[in-house]
């Protein structure tokens, strides 16, 4: 029998290499049984995760999963950093692993580097 706990499917130590000026959708896959939980996004500032207020978010429904999406329209250099989604379920808070956005400002990069290069070259990133 499958668990009916809410589960948030963001992989530990996952990351996305993206470019300033591009649109980007950050997805939080949510598995639930009966009632869809309230889900929020926050951005890590040290050990504190600061809730993102007033941002464009949406839901996408697929067969076995729902996705709570944080929209970046467009990506800004200041969007660099780690994000976490949280679900409020039966008065409990379920937190996902954090996922990191590595933002490259195309103005400072003569050509777009590969994903691997970006993840291994912190001097391209904004803090």
């Amino acid at each position: 029998k499958e668990s009916c706990d809410v589960q948030l499917y963001i992989k530990r130590q996952s990351y996305h290499s993206i470019f300033a000026g591009d649109p980007f959708k950050l997805e939080c896959p949510v598995k639930y049984c009966a009632h869809r939980p309230q889900v929020t996004w926050c951005k890590l500032n040290g050990t504190t995760c600061v809730k993102l207020e007033g941002r464009h978010t949406s839901w996408k429904q697929e067969k076995n999963l729902s996705f709570f999406i944080l929209h970046f329209e467009p990506v800004l250099p200041s969007d660099n950093g780690s994000y976490r989604c949280s679900a409020n379920f039966l008065s409990a808070i379920i937190e996902s692993h954090s996922t990191t956005l590595y933002v490259t400002d195309v103005k400072s990069a003569s050509e777009r580097p590969s994903k691997d290069e970006m993840a291994s070259r912190p001097w391209l990133l904004y803090s």
Epitope: Q7, Y9, I10, K11, E95, A119
Partner: antibody
Framework: EVQLVESGGGLVQPGRSLRLSCTTS????????IHWFRQAPGKGLEWVGR????????KYTASFKGRATISADGSKSIAYLQMNSLKTEDTAVYYC????????????WGQGTLVTVSS | EIVLTQSPGTLSLSPGERATLSCRSS???????????LNWLQQKPGQAPRRLIY???KLDSGIPDRFSGSGSGTDFTLTISRLEPEDFAVYYC?????????FGQGTKLEIK
């Protein structure tokens, strides 16, 4: 039944390249990280790097960066390790392993494939 | 890079005895999510390793409960409460908190 089967090992000359395959079944590869490890004869285990089959992102140990490429084809449930400019000290058994990425719920290993680098 | 140091290098015991294996890390393995990603693997001659324990103390499915893991921060222990003949093998700790992931050098558990 869960299976990870490595293939592509064998005798290879120094300076040449080799591509190892890791064929998986019994789980969704996209829910996991695929790791490659190696073990030189009579020695301990060493982590080469890992791939996220869901998006292709990779991480490597510094000594393998630029010489090893880990990739995966999620639709075929196969992962690969490409090793270039092989040296005699790359002689080892190479293992792939699949670790669930969300809650650490499983960590499956293949049986390994022996790569011998010799002229 | 994190250095994991296992001790002893070799442990000679008899079936039925209790085995205590140590793994010490050069820095804390506590991740910012509050979890500690320290694993124990068992490897028998000519075989692939298999995961026994993850997150310091969680037992993999199918692993007998005579195996247990404990510790925090930088000091970790694998205990086998009552050795069975099939437990004689090499045991490795490895951490996947910090990149690059690293292994201890192994402890060989042999029959006395």
């Amino acid at each position: 039944e869960v299976q990870l089967v490595e293939s592509g090992g064998g005798l290879v000359q120094p300076g040449r390249s080799l591509r190892l395959s890791c064929t998986t079944s019994g789980f969704n590869i996209k829910d996991t990280y695929i790791h490659w490890f190696r073990q030189a004869p009579g020695k301990g285990l060493e982590w080469v790097g890992r791939n996220d089959p869901a998006n292709g992102n990779t991480k490597y140990t510094a000594s393998f960066k630029g010489r090893a490429t880990i990739s995966a084809d999620g639709s075929k449930s196969i992962a690969y390790l490409q090793m270039n400019s092989l040296k005699t000290e790359d002689t080892a058994v190479y293992y792939c392993a699949s670790y669930e990425g969300y809650y650490e719920r499983f960590g499956y290993w293949g049986q390994g494939t022996l790569v011998t680098v010799s002229s | 890079e994190i250095v994991l140091t296992q001790s002893p290098g070799t442990l000679s015991l008899s079936p039925g005895e209790r085995a205590t294996l140590s793994c010490r890390s050069s820095q804390s393995l506590l991740d910012r999510d509050g979890k500690t990603y320290l694993n124990w693997l068992q490897q028998k001659p000519g075989q692939a390793p298999r995961r026994l324990i993850y997150l310091v103390s969680k037992l993999d499915s199918g692993i007998p409960d005579r195996f247990s893991g404990s510790g925090s921060g930088t000091d970790f222990t694998l205990t086998i409460s009552r050795l069975e003949p099939e437990d004689f093998a090499v045991y490795y700790c490895w951490q996947d908190t910090h990149f690059p992931y690293t292994f201890g050098q192994g402890t060989k558990l042999e029959i006395k």
